[in-house]
């Protein structure tokens, strides 16, 4: 019988009462065989968190900078349930720290020092840990003691809780730096009141202190916020403008075998059973004997985090960043406006050689990092562990809702201003072998079919966007008898004709054969009837221009496309016969590193992109023996995007809104995690 | 103008080893990491493996556990250790590092 007890992590008697009195609770409304509470009493949080690592307890609930805690080594634990504010219908499970400023001070983010800081107080998240960790690197040397710095950089701050004494620049704004209410620039609604009576130029608070403190627009019209990339955007659009974004108060358990389904089932049975207005007798939010016992008062109930985020993700890049630099105080030997290397984030093992070649080609600019999956390189670039890589439509589309930016595109036409013109797009067709000559798009039931990937935008999302649109069902594994689309489910009938070996079958990277568009092609060729690809890879595959075994003796004419309308046509009429225009191929990055990455890239495709003439003695950034390694092989340039600087703008609404009816469909883990943080 | 010269090859039964070597003349060689490729009769030269300034080393699919690749910065040379041969390995091997024309290469035989 599986053990279906969560020991609960108690930091105090009264917890450990309120603990026991859950027990009890549950124990009187769950059947024998569902889940069950039992309390766990320990002298502090971090003594906690040991204690789920070593297995002698299973959850306890944290504020944002002890989930950081507990995620660093040894400890290794993840967040798997959230508390939630607000209503059911809009949850708040993050807040975000902002620094607000007034709109007619004319200074930008990377401005800040000589100004007038006003702080929530010392040792706060949004109003002194945020801010100053993610400042750290720019206060004067030395660094230690913090408080020092922090008053040598700013001209004058209002820090409460700060030692008057010892550092009394940080409390010039509010004499004495009273650490409670008598001190009228404490806490949100007194940093915010700190910069609104003029003593400061910034207040370091939170998203909602600006509305909590003026409920008229008008009046909330005259400040800003400033944002990372040293620009400037209104007060309610603080999801795009803000220095971090802070889960409020989130239960962790052990990242191997640590229940995490187990404790959802209680929690989600305990907020049935005892959450906001359900229970006289015990209430799960409330603390008659104290503040905010096991679970936030103000909380409303639990949202279950999605199982592919981890610690890192789940706090975010940006407050990592600022905790990080605060813990370990560590920053690069001077700050030079000279750009880091890159680091390109590389799929399996063909891509990781081209990578490591171009990274030896490029004298020390580009640095390679290795995933399996296209959406393991996201999560790494997401999390800073890789910068860049050049994504698919399909991909750049998760990649935006995770964050992340495109900065420039995969062009596919010879131009006299490549590098100026992002083009329109390529055109996503399905291929059908001119012998099977009764087949049309409106009986594809039943057939055999051969995708790019799982995600993908030629090969995915335009055909089985427009198949759902006609079968209104998700079940694409039912509609074609067998295929392969790598990323899908391996029992799947779609992997069913995959030819990876082992565990690289169906594998949505070069290790499967049938990968991508050649790979979806040669499926066609070998097994299918049936392939999703692009305009160009019939011609970029037939005519002896693919020398591999498989390819090169095929004839273009012996292929055909399917055109919506029940008809085919030959294959160099894809212009009238298409299933839709796909946005071309996209480099992501994050924000922090758009400028970089931008610089950088433009340089090394001077150096290495198609106006080399000789690859063999060369290296081409553009070319692969083993097919679309890093950028696909017909990139003649990558181009600037101008005003399409955001996932949107760049996809357009058209394919953004194909993509989002898709998402009812969508197995991508990622997406469901990076929605979580922004729904 | 620094200067690659390979040598070390030759012509082995299959099964058999041979040790390449890549030596420069000049300073600042392999700075930025230094490449092997080779290159069959009638076929696209291709990168067997390379090695980085700091250590790193990396390898094509095929040649993976049968070669190893080493380096001397004081003797300003690089190794490619070749062992379990096959007549696939056959062709002209070359070494390679940025800003540096590629040399007259070394030739390999695998053949019964």
């Known amino acids: 019988v599986p053990d279906k007890t969560v020991r609960w992590c108690a930091v105090s008697e009264h917890e450990a009462t309120k603990c026991q009195s859950f027990r009890d609770h549950m124990k009187s409304v769950i059947p024998s065989d569902g889940p069950s509470v039992a309390c766990v009493k320990k002298a502090s949080y971090l003594d906690c968190i040991r204690a789920i690592a070593a297995n002698e307890a299973d959850a306890v609930t944290l504020d944002a900078g002890l989930v950081y805690d507990a995620y660093l080594a040894p400890n290794n634990l993840k967040p798997v349930v959230a508390e939630f504010y607000g209503s059911k219908e809009d949850p708040q499970t993050f807040y975000y720290a902002v620094a607000v400023v007034k709109k007619d001070s004319g200074f930008q983010m990377n401005q800040l020092r000589g100004k007038k800081s006003c702080h929530t107080g010392l040792g706060r998240s949004a109003g002194w840990n945020i801010p100053i960790g993610l400042l750290y690197c720019d206060l004067p040397e030395p660094r230690k003691p913090l408080e020092k710095a922090v008053a040598n950089f700013f001209s004058g701050s209002c820090a409460p809780c700060a030692d008057g004494t010892d550092f009394p620049q940080l409390c010039q704004l509010c004499p004495g730096c009273g650490c409670s209410t008598l001190n009228q620039y404490f806490g949100y609604s007194g940093a915010f009141k700190c910069l609104k009576d003029g003593a400061g130029d910034v207040a370091f608070v939170k998203h909602s202190t600006i509305f909590e403190n003026l409920a008229n627009k008008a009046d909330r019209d005259q400040y800003e916020l400033l944002c990372l990339d040293n620009t400037r955007k209104p007060v309610d659009e603080y999801k795009d403008c803000h220095l971090a974004q802070v889960p409020s108060h989130t239960v962790v358990a052990r990242s191997m075998g640590g229940k995490e389904d187990l404790i959802w089932e209680l929690l989600n049975q305990a907020q049935e059973h005892f959450g906001k207005d359900k229970s006289k007798e015990f209430q799960l939010f409330s603390s008659p004997h104290g503040k905010d016992l096991l679970f936030k008062d103000s909380a409303h109930g639990f949202l279950k985090v999605p199982p592919r985020m981890d610690a890192k993700m789940y706090l975010g890049y940006e407050y990592v960043t600022a905790i990080r630099n605060l813990r370990e105080g560590t920053c690069p030997e001077a700050p030079t406006d000279e750009c880091k290397p890159v680091k390109w984030c590389a799929l399996s093992h063909h891509e990781r050689l081209k990578c490591d070649e171009w990274s030896v080609n490029s004298v020390g600019k580009i640095e390679c990092v290795s995933a399996e999956t296209t959406e393991d390189c996201i999560a790494k670039i997401m999390n800073g562990e890789a910068d860049a890589m050049s994504l698919d439509g399909g991909f750049v589309y998760i990649a935006g809702k995770c964050g992340l930016v495109p900065v420039l595109a995969e062009n596919y036409n010879k131009s006299d201003n490549c590098e100026d013109t992002p083009e329109a797009g390529y055109f996503a067709i399905a291929v059908v072998k001119k012998s099977a000559s009764d087949l049309t798009w409106d009986n594809l039931k039943g057939k055999k079919s051969c995708h790019t990937a799982v995600g993908r935008t030629a090969g995915w999302n335009i055909p089985m966007g427009l198949l759902y649109n006609k079968i209104n069902h998700c079940r694409f594994d039912e509609f074609f008898s067998e295929g392969c689309a790598p990323g899908s489910k391996k029992d799947s009938s779609l992997c069913k004709l995959c030819m990876g070996s082992g565990l690289n079958l169906c594998e949505p990277n070069n290790k499967e054969g049938y990968y991508g568009y050649t790979g979806a092609f040669r499926c066609l060729v070998e097994k299918g009837d049936v392939a999703f690809v692009k305009h160009q890879t019939v011609p970029q595959n037939t005519g002896g221009k693919n020398p591999d075994p498989w390819a090169k003796n095929l004839n273009e004419k012996d292929y055909e496309l399917l055109c919506l309308d029940g008809t085919r046509k030959p294959v160099e009429e894809y212009a009238n016969c298409h299933l839709a225009r796909a946005p071309n191929h996209a480099v992501v990055t994050r924000k922090d590193k758009e400028a970089c990455v931008h610089k950088i890239l433009r340089q090394q495709q001077h150096l290495f992109g198609s106006n080399v003439t000789d690859c063999s003695g060369n290296f081409c950034l553009f070319r692969s023996e083993t097919k679309d390694l890093l950028f696909r092989d017909d990139t003649v340039c990558l181009a600037k995007l101008h005003d399409r600087n955001t996932y949107e703008k760049y996809l357009g609404e058209e394919y953004v809104k194909a993509v989002g009816n898709l998402r009812k469909c969508s197995t991508s883990s990622l997406l469901e995690a990076c929605t979580f943080r922004r729904p | 103008q620094v200067q690659l010269v390979e040598s070390g090859g030759g012509l082995v039964q299959p099964g058999g080893s041979l040790r390449l070597s890549c030596v420069a003349s000049?300073?600042?060689?392999?700075?930025?990491?230094v490449i092997w490729y080779r290159q069959a009769p009638g076929k696209q030269r291709e990168l067997v493996a390379l090695?980085?300034?700091?250590?790193?080393?990396n390898y094509r699919e095929s040649v993976k556990g049968r070669f190893t690749i080493s380096r001397d910065d004081a003797k300003n040379t690089v190794w490619l250790q070749m062992n379990a041969l096959e007549p696939e390995d056959t062709g002209v091997y070359y070494c390679?590092?940025?800003?540096?024309?590629f040399g007259q290469g070394t030739q390999v035989t695998v053949s019964s």
């Open positions: 390679k590092t940025p800003g540096v024309p």
């Open positions: 000049g300073s600042g060689f392999g700075i930025n990491g």
């Open positions: 090695i980085k300034s700091d250590g790193y080393t």
